[in-house]
Interface confidence: low
């Protein structure tokens, strides 16, 4: 990759090793200013693989609230509005970064954590295993 | 909410204000050990709203590589394998947290940033506006 010269105005760090402890400003910068927050708000209901959203709360995590998608059906909704079990509703999962308080209950010390969340559901053709 | 007593072993913090700077250990803890690695590997191809994945790289961000989904079609794939334009393929988007180097090019100083990524696509019934 490209080697970028270190900024001389960087804060000092005593620990030069990786894994390392870094300083993080929790004043979140939001790059999503041009997005319409309503745009995908009803996909969960209009999808052929609809899903429900469940609240997952953990005060020791930042962000403390994460919404998890759970597919409503094993099959997908067909043109008649019925569930077609020849197709499968499956969760689309994504790994996300969260901050975990470490040591526990500390307001100013965190560890980076990777968790798997279900973001929504999609309709897929099932894999059929043919027995010889 | 429940007030959790502060752990007496917490690191000291000089800045008690919010927005605040915190210490974060970048040694990522992975909570996803029980996931089946095959489970979602080919949904992008098998979905009725298939998508391609594009690499988004930014050395000033952590993680530096994020993969973005882009729906292949405006419509959805029907049972005959053709694109049905009476339905719409739409991206499922999620806001995720990343770390942005701040000041730029600093190895040990970051700011939390929220970005919107497309994780995959789902097939939805279109909203039809009838003109009076």
């Amino acid at each position: 990759g490209i080697t970028i010269p270190r900024n001389p105005g960087c804060p000092n760090s005593e620990d030069k090793n990786f894994p390392r402890t870094v300083m993080v400003n929790l004043n979140i910068h939001n790059r999503n200013t041009n997005t319409n927050p309503k745009r995908s708000s009803d996909y969960y209901n209009r999808s052929t693989s609809p899903w429900n959203l469940h609240r997952n709360e953990d005060p020791e995590r930042y962000p403390s609230v994460i919404w998890e998608a759970k597919c409503r059906h094993l099959g997908c909704i067909n043109a008649d509005g019925n569930v077609d079990y020849h197709m499968n509703s499956v969760p689309i999962q994504q790994e996300i970064l969260v901050l975990r308080r470490e040591p526990p209950h500390c307001p100013n010390s965190f560890r980076l954590e990777k968790i798997l969340v279900s973001v929504g559901c999609t309709c897929v053709t099932p894999i059929v295993h043919h027995v010889a | 909410g429940i007030t959790i007593p502060r752990n007496p072993g917490c690191p000291n913090s000089e800045d008690k204000n919010f927005p605040r700077t915190v210490m974060v250990n970048l040694n990522i803890h992975n909570r996803n050990t029980n996931t089946n690695p095959k489970r979602s590997s080919d949904y992008y191809n098998r979905s009725t709203s298939p998508w391609n994945l594009h690499r988004n790289e930014d050395p000033e961000r952590y993680p530096s590589v994020i993969w973005e989904a882009k729906c292949r079609h405006l419509g959805c794939i029907n049972a005959d394998g053709n694109v049905d334009y009476h339905m719409n393929s739409v991206p499922i988007q999620q806001e995720i947290l990343v770390l942005r180097r701040e000041p730029p090019h600093c190895p040990n100083s970051f700011r939390l940033e929220k970005i919107l990524v497309s994780v995959g696509c789902t097939c939805v019934t279109p909203i039809v506006h009838h003109v009076a």
Epitope: Q93, E95 | T35, K38, S40, S41, Y43, V65, V119
Partner: nanobody, 119 residues
Framework: EVQLVESGGGLVQPGGSLRLSCAAS????????MYWVRQAPGKGLEWVAS????????YYVDSVKGRFTISRDNAKNSLYLQMNSLRAEDTAVYYC????????????WGQGTLVTVSS
């Protein structure tokens, strides 16, 4: 720190062969399914092949079946892709990836190795 380093790419004529290697470190290699994926110029990512932890199960995208063979050596923390009967449409940057290829959030990918098939 997870590291994946691919090698073995290069320029080859149609019908030729190449063997790609991926050296893994920073995680328990034998505990993860591994993947080869590729990205042709200006195109989206395409999954090519995957192999289970113990090498017992292998999967291939239809376009490479019978031509490509994925293998692994857990003792050496290495993943391989033997590519035979190469075609122009196999031209791409090839990446090895750890675990599932979705979601694609973490940079558990190498920088890739370029394979160019041209006469």
């Amino acid at each position: 720190e997870v590291q994946l380093v691919e090698s073995g790419g290069g320029l080859v004529q149609p019908g030729g062969s190449l063997r790609l290697s991926c050296a893994a470190s920073g995680f328990t290699f034998s505990s993860y399914g591994m993947y080869w994926v590729r990205q042709a110029p200006g195109k989206g990512l395409e999954w090519v092949a995957s192999i289970e932890q113990d090498g017992s199960e292998k999967y291939y995208v239809d376009s490479v079946k019978g031509r490509f063979t994925i293998s692994r050596d857990n003792a050496k923390n290495s993943l391989y892709l033997q590519m035979n009967s190469l075609r122009a449409e196999d031209t791409a940057v090839y990446y090895c990836a750890k675990g599932e290829i979705l979601p694609l959030y973490f940079d558990y990918w190498g920088q890739g190795t370029l394979v160019t098939v041209s006469s």
